[in-house]
Structure formats: structure tokens, C-alpha cells
């Protein structure tokens, strides 16, 4: 790839996060420099991730300003990797019925959650919400991530298209905007009515579909109320 | 090492209000969210509500809507709660607790605030 | 809201007895309930997450255990600093409390 500034990267247009919310509270998955993961009350520029979808529901996961990949231990922990292991770094994805999406190491089982527990995934089951996300479009101007594209990075000098087989870093436009009849918030399970316990509106749309197919006939998911 | 330090006790008249802080240190203070919980005499813990340190936004229990006022300070790495309209039942020790996705780890000392004609 | 109930709301025991404290949920939470333990003048202290670890530096003689609606906090072998009030809290809607369990000396 050429060291070109990423904003002539088309992919840049189609940055995501991933955020687990709750009624009250959301926090976004971030991959820092240092390959720590945590979550974020907000967008954050090591927030804004790349996910490539692949056969049979695997995804990769890519954290644009870390450059680094979302990849999980034997134990369950995240972390980012500047190096690409098939079997540590991919995720299957799935979709509740709910609409919410989790993520889970085909190698190891666990879920990729937020929260500190390592919890395995078993079809059918209901996962705490920190370990459910919703996807949402970047709203950090792309000014700030003044940073080279993310690639792959292998002991090996093949060329490009040996390091990156999966084609990660030049994701495909696959970002379509929810319908219009989405955009609106779930009711609230404590208030009767939606703006009583969030008067200063801070619970906004943005979010995307970032997995081909939809959750239903319209592919909606869940608007969901956070702050 | 991760602290919530709050304001001194304070003792009120009904109808009136208070304004309690919180000034957290030992971490990124826009990194996590900050909650408000009391507890009245001899009784449980109550959620009263959440803000987003790094855009100011909240989120109340219903109960509280339209009396409590939670707002924070970056620069100093502290936020406030402020309940009005005081009555009686106001009376409780009133906390601030960090959360970590999965629990409130981190506790203020607490304030206690006596409503009091 | 989701409500949560404790049982027994207090009890009384003996250094060396084994305790338990159930904690139920209005609806499914899945495994998001915390248990605290307080004293009196202090603040709540976290025992247990996601239903079942242990926080760091909590003595391993606390565990729980439970999904969905129904949650347990089981003290082994009960010592002279667990006579406390212990409350769950569940984080899957909202954040409400259980009304507490205090265990006292027999």
C-alpha cells in the first residue's frame, strides 16, 4: 500500500464503532496504541474501526488509528495485534434476536464483551448487555486520523497481497443507513414517556447496518437509549 | 491510585437546594461515566442518575426528573449533583460512584445532607 | 423498571457459618448483577461482577453464582468483618438496587 494520507482511502468513508448500550449508558469498543482494549463513553478516535465481513459470518476486526487488529487469548481477553493470526483474530457474527450483535472467538468460544468476565457463547443464550453492540457510523472528522492505513504485518516479505489474503484493509462499501422507520427510540422500560428521562435529547441515531443482510424484513435494529 | 473525593455535609432548609462534588483523580476522568446514588437514614441504596463526563449529558431516575441538575467540570475533574426543592425526605447520605461497564467500582466517601426546618 | 428482591432481608449468624443471600430479578437480566457489601458510615464496597467473579482483593470465602432471574451470594465460612448489609444491583436496564440484606451476630 502506499504511504498515501489515509483520507484518499475510500475505506475511510465507511469507519464504524462498536458500542454496547444499555437504557441508561453506552460505551464504545477501543483499540489503543498499545494494543489495550477498553470501552469509551463516547466516540473516540481509537474507536473507529474497520470491520471486514467473510464467509459463514466470520468477521475482522481492525482499529483504524492503533492499526491494529481486534484479536482474542486462549483466556478470552482482547487485545490489539499489530500481527494477523486467523485463528486468534477473527470473530463469527452473529445476530440476536433482539438486533444486537455479538462477536465470539471460534477458537476459544468466549464472547468479546466490554465487561471483565470471560464468558463462552452457546446458541440460544442471552448475553449480558456489555457484551451485545450496536454499530454506528464515525462522527470524528477525518482530519484527525492523521494516520497511515492500517496493514497487515508479517515476519514475511511477501507483497501486499500475500499480507493481507483477506483483503482487510480495503474493505468493500458495505455500510447501508438503517431505514428511516428505525430511527426511533425503544421505549423506555422505567418511563412513560421516551423524553422524560432524556429531556436534553442526548440519545441520537447514526446507526449502521455494518454486516450484509438485515434483521428482519426491514433490517432494523434496536434504537437504543443512552446518554 | 483512583479517588472520589466529595464535599463537606451540609444541612438544609425545605424548598431549598444543595449542590454536592465529586472530584475524581487517579484516572482519565472522560473515560468512564460518573453515577449518583443516596441513601436515606437506615435504608437502601437508590439510583438517582448518570452523566457523561465528556459531553455533559444525563440521564435521571424518573422519581428525580426535573429537581435534579447533574453537570461536570473537565478541567477539574469533578462533577455535581444538585437537588432542589428540598423536602424531609431529602435527607440521606448522597454518593458518587465511577462505572466500569459491569459495576460501580470506585465510591465517593458520601455527604451527608439533612433537609431540616 | 426491573425490579430486585432479597431474601432473607436480614439474618443472623455466627463466625464460621456458612451464608447465603438470594437475589431475584422482575425479568431476565442474563448475568449482569453485582453484589456490594456496606458497613455502617461507609460506602458500598464491590464483592462480585457478572454474577459470578470476584472482584480483585475480595477474600475467595465470598462467590456467586445465578443467570437470569435468580442470583446467589454465598459466604462460605462467615468471619468477624463480613457482618455487613449486602446488596445486589443489576446493570442489564437501568441500575436499580436490591432493599439489602444485613447480616448481624447471633
Known amino acids: 500500500y502506499p504511504n498515501a494520507s489515509p483520507l484518499l482511502g475510500s475505506s475511510w468513508g465507511g469507519l464504524i464503532h462498536l458500542y454496547t448500550a444499555t437504557a441508561r449508558n453506552s460505551y464504545h469498543l477501543q483499540i489503543h496504541k498499545n494494543g489495550h482494549v477498553d470501552g469509551a463513553p463516547h466516540q473516540t478516535i481509537y474507536s473507529a474501526l474497520m470491520i471486514r465481513s467473510e464467509d459463514a459470518g466470520f468477521v475482522v476486526i481492525t482499529g483504524v488509528m492503533s492499526r491494529r487488529y481486534l484479536c482474542m487469548d486462549f483466556r478470552g481477553n482482547i487485545f490489539g495485534s499489530h500481527y494477523f493470526d486467523p485463528e486468534n483474530c477473527r470473530f463469527q457474527h452473529q445476530t440476536l434476536e433482539n438486533g444486537y450483535d455479538v462477536y465470539h472467538s471460534p477458537q476459544y468460544h468466549f464472547l468479546v464483551s466490554l465487561g471483565r468476565a470471560k464468558r463462552a457463547f452457546l446458541p440460544g443464550m442471552n448475553p449480558p448487555p456489555y457484551s451485545q453492540f450496536l454499530s454506528r457510523r464515525n462522527e470524528i472528522p477525518l482530519i484527525h486520523f492523521n494516520t497511515p492505513i492500517p496493514r497487515r504485518h508479517t515476519q514475511s516479505a511477501e507483497d501486499d497481497s500475500e499480507r493481507d489474503p483477506l483483503n482487510v484493509l480495503k474493505p468493500r462499501a458495505r455500510m447501508t443507513p438503517a431505514p428511516a422507520s428505525c430511527s426511533q427510540e425503544l421505549p423506555s422500560a422505567e418511563d412513560n414517556s421516551p423524553m422524560a428521562s432524556d429531556p436534553l435529547g442526548v440519545v441520537r441515531g447514526g446507526r449502521v447496518n455494518t454486516h450484509a443482510g438485515g434483521t428482519g424484513p426491514e433490517g432494523c435494529r434496536p434504537f437504543a437509549k443512552f446518554i | 491510585q483512583v479517588q472520589l473525593v466529595q464535599s463537606g455535609a451540609e444541612v438544609k432548609k425545605p424548598g431549598a437546594s444543595v449542590k454536592v462534588s465529586c472530584k475524581a483523580s487517579?484516572?482519565?476522568?472522560?473515560?468512564?461515566?460518573m453515577h449518583w446514588v443516596r441513601q436515606a437514614p437506615g435504608q437502601g441504596l437508590e439510583w438517582m442518575g448518570i452523566?457523561?463526563?465528556?459531553?455533559?449529558?444525563?440521564s435521571n431516575a424518573q422519581k428525580f426528573q426535573g429537581r435534579v441538575t447533574m453537570t461536570r467540570d473537565t478541567s477539574t475533574s469533578t462533577v455535581y449533583m444538585e437537588l432542589s426543592s428540598l423536602r424531609s425526605e431529602d435527607t440521606a447520605v448522597y454518593y458518587c460512584?465511577?462505572?466500569?461497564?459491569?459495576?460501580?467500582?470506585?465510591w465517593g466517601q458520601g455527604t451527608m445532607v439533612t433537609v431540616s426546618s | 423498571a426491573i425490579q430486585l428482591t432479597q431474601s432473607p432481608s436480614s439474618l443472623s449468624a455466627s463466625v464460621g457459618d456458612r451464608v447465603t443471600i438470594t437475589c431475584r430479578a422482575s425479568q431476565g437480566i442474563s448475568s449482569a448483577l453485582v453484589w456490594y457489601q456496606q458497613k455502617p458510615g461507609k460506602a458500598p464496597k464491590l464483592l462480585i461482577y457478572d454474577a459470578s467473579f470476584l472482584e480483585s482483593g475480595v477474600p475467595s470465602r465470598f462467590s456467586g453464582s445465578g443467570s437470569g432471574t435468580d442470583f446467589t451470594l454465598t459466604i462460605s465460612s462467615l468471619q468477624p468483618e463480613d457482618f455487613a448489609t449486602y446488596y445486589c444491583q443489576q446493570f442489564n436496564d437501568y441500575f436499580t438496587f436490591g432493599p439489602g440484606t444485613k447480616v448481624d451476630i447471633k
Open positions: 452523566i457523561n463526563p465528556i459531553s455533559g449529558s444525563t
Open positions: 487517579g484516572y482519565t476522568f472522560t473515560n468512564h461515566y
Open positions: 460512584a465511577r462505572d466500569i461497564v459491569d459495576a460501580f467500582d470506585f
